[in-house]
């Protein structure tokens, strides 16, 4: 059944302590030039959370259940895209649907390509499920061809 | 190639504090989980915690809350393990190790023999 | 938190013999299809190794004598022919659930 973050433990049985983060893809930092100037590839991915409900909550910031979700997605990707040229990602969004997660993963360009980047997510699912008690579905992984402009960004590996 | 080196033994006297190492190489040190494994003398294995240095999450078994405190400095790529008050009973050998989602612990440091004795 | 017990303690053996070492698991450590469930071995005065990650994936530069098997509750480590260096301790980890939990061990020593 699905349950809330506020029942949601980092890790079961422990103690944890989180201190975020990393600093946000944003349009000061990283051109929004198209990619061959820039050297950065962008992707599109969307994935279901079926364990978890979505609320109102998700729709602000500055809840601790947003908070807690985005610092815990944030932190997936470093262990994900560990090999190198993952610089972060940005646009985080959560959406009805148990929780649908929106959010755009930024590469140095020629380091990796959409079916890699599906890849890897979908041989995390187990470790998401055991570190962080998230059920992951329905990943889908597209390019992002056109600049746009990163904002809201949830976190770039320091 | 990976490696994780460990600072060398030490001897205390209880109630001394004592901060142990662990710097790794030859990998993206902040992507990975390091671990802390405790092994008191002829026993076996037991998990401590853990940090992940990109974000300085940190994870303890409840056994050991409140009695150790797990810390990184990522510029320098080093784990550390640290006492306020040692007691005899915190002598052992500890081990630091990576922790990758794929296959659990599969690095290890060579081992810190902390002795604790007045 | 899963508690691994490990058997026999201690198994006597002469090289050339097959051992078998088994870990049960105080509850299921399977999730989608994967185990996680992984096998260690240690010699005195060294730092563990790992042999076996995912009930049953031989680690990089471990001799395709060890093997794994297993899944749910309970795993098997298998060393089909034993060489003098194989004597040690072998643990069983789990990390399904926080905290991570190691078996007892299970100390394989010459006959």
């Known amino acids: 059944t699905p349950t809330t973050l506020a029942s949601h433990s980092t890790k079961t049985d422990a103690s944890s302590t989180h201190h975020s983060s990393v600093p946000p893809l944003t349009s000061s930092n990283h051109s929004t030039s198209p990619q061959l100037s820039t050297g950065v590839s962008f992707f599109f991915l969307s994935f279901h959370i079926s364990n978890l409900q979505f609320n109102s909550s998700l729709e602000d910031p500055s809840t601790d259940y947003y908070q807690e979700l985005q610092r815990d997605i944030s932190e997936m990707f470093l262990q994900i895209y560990k090999q190198g040229g993952f610089l972060g990602l940005s646009n985080i969004k959560f959406r009805p649907g148990s929780v649908v997660v929106q959010l755009t993963l930024a590469f140095r360009e020629g380091t990796i390509n959409v079916h890699d980047v599906e890849t890897q997510f979908n041989q995390y699912k187990t470790e998401a499920a055991s570190r962080y008690n998230l059920t992951i579905s329905d990943v889908s992984v597209s390019d992002v061809p056109f600049p746009f402009s990163a904002q809201s960004g949830a976190g770039v590996p320091g | 190639e990976v490696q994780l080196v460990q600072s060398g033994a030490e001897v205390k006297k209880p109630g001394e504090s004592l901060k142990i190492s662990c710097k790794g190489s030859?990998?993206?040190?902040?992507?990975?989980?390091i671990e802390w494994v405790r092994q008191m003398p002829g026993k076996g294995l037991e998990w401590m915690g853990e940090?992940?240095?990109?974000?300085?999450?940190?994870n303890y078994n409840e056994k050991f809350k409140g009695q150790v405190t797990i810390s990184a400095d990522k510029s320098i790529s080093t784990a550390y393990l640290q006492w306020s008050s040692l007691k005899a009973s915190d002598t052992a050998m500890y081990y630091c190790?990576?922790?990758?989602?794929?296959?659990?612990?599969?690095?290890w440091g060579q081992g810190t023999l902390v002795t604790v004795s007045s | 938190e899963i508690v691994l017990t490990q058997s026999p303690a201690t198994l006597s053996l002469s090289p050339g013999e097959r051992a078998t070492l088994s870990c049960r698991a105080s509850?299921?450590?399977?999730?989608?299809?994967?185990?996680?469930m992984h096998w260690y071995q240690q010699k005195p005065g060294q730092a563990p190794r790992l042999l076996i990650y995912g009930a049953s994936n031989v680690e990089t530069g471990i001799p395709a004598r060890f093997s794994g098997s297993g899944s749910g509750t309970d795993f098997t480590l298998t060393i089909s022919s034993l060489e003098p260096e194989d004597f040690a301790v072998y643990y069983c980890q789990q990390n399904w659930k926080v905290p991570w939990t190691f078996g007892q061990g299970t100390k394989v020593e010459i006959k």
């Open positions: 190790a990576r922790y990758d989602y794929t296959s659990s612990m599969d690095y």
């Open positions: 940090i992940l240095p990109g974000t300085g999450s940190t």
């Open positions: 030859g990998f993206t040190f902040n992507y990975f989980w």
């Open positions: 509850e299921s450590v399977q999730y989608s299809g994967t185990s996680l």
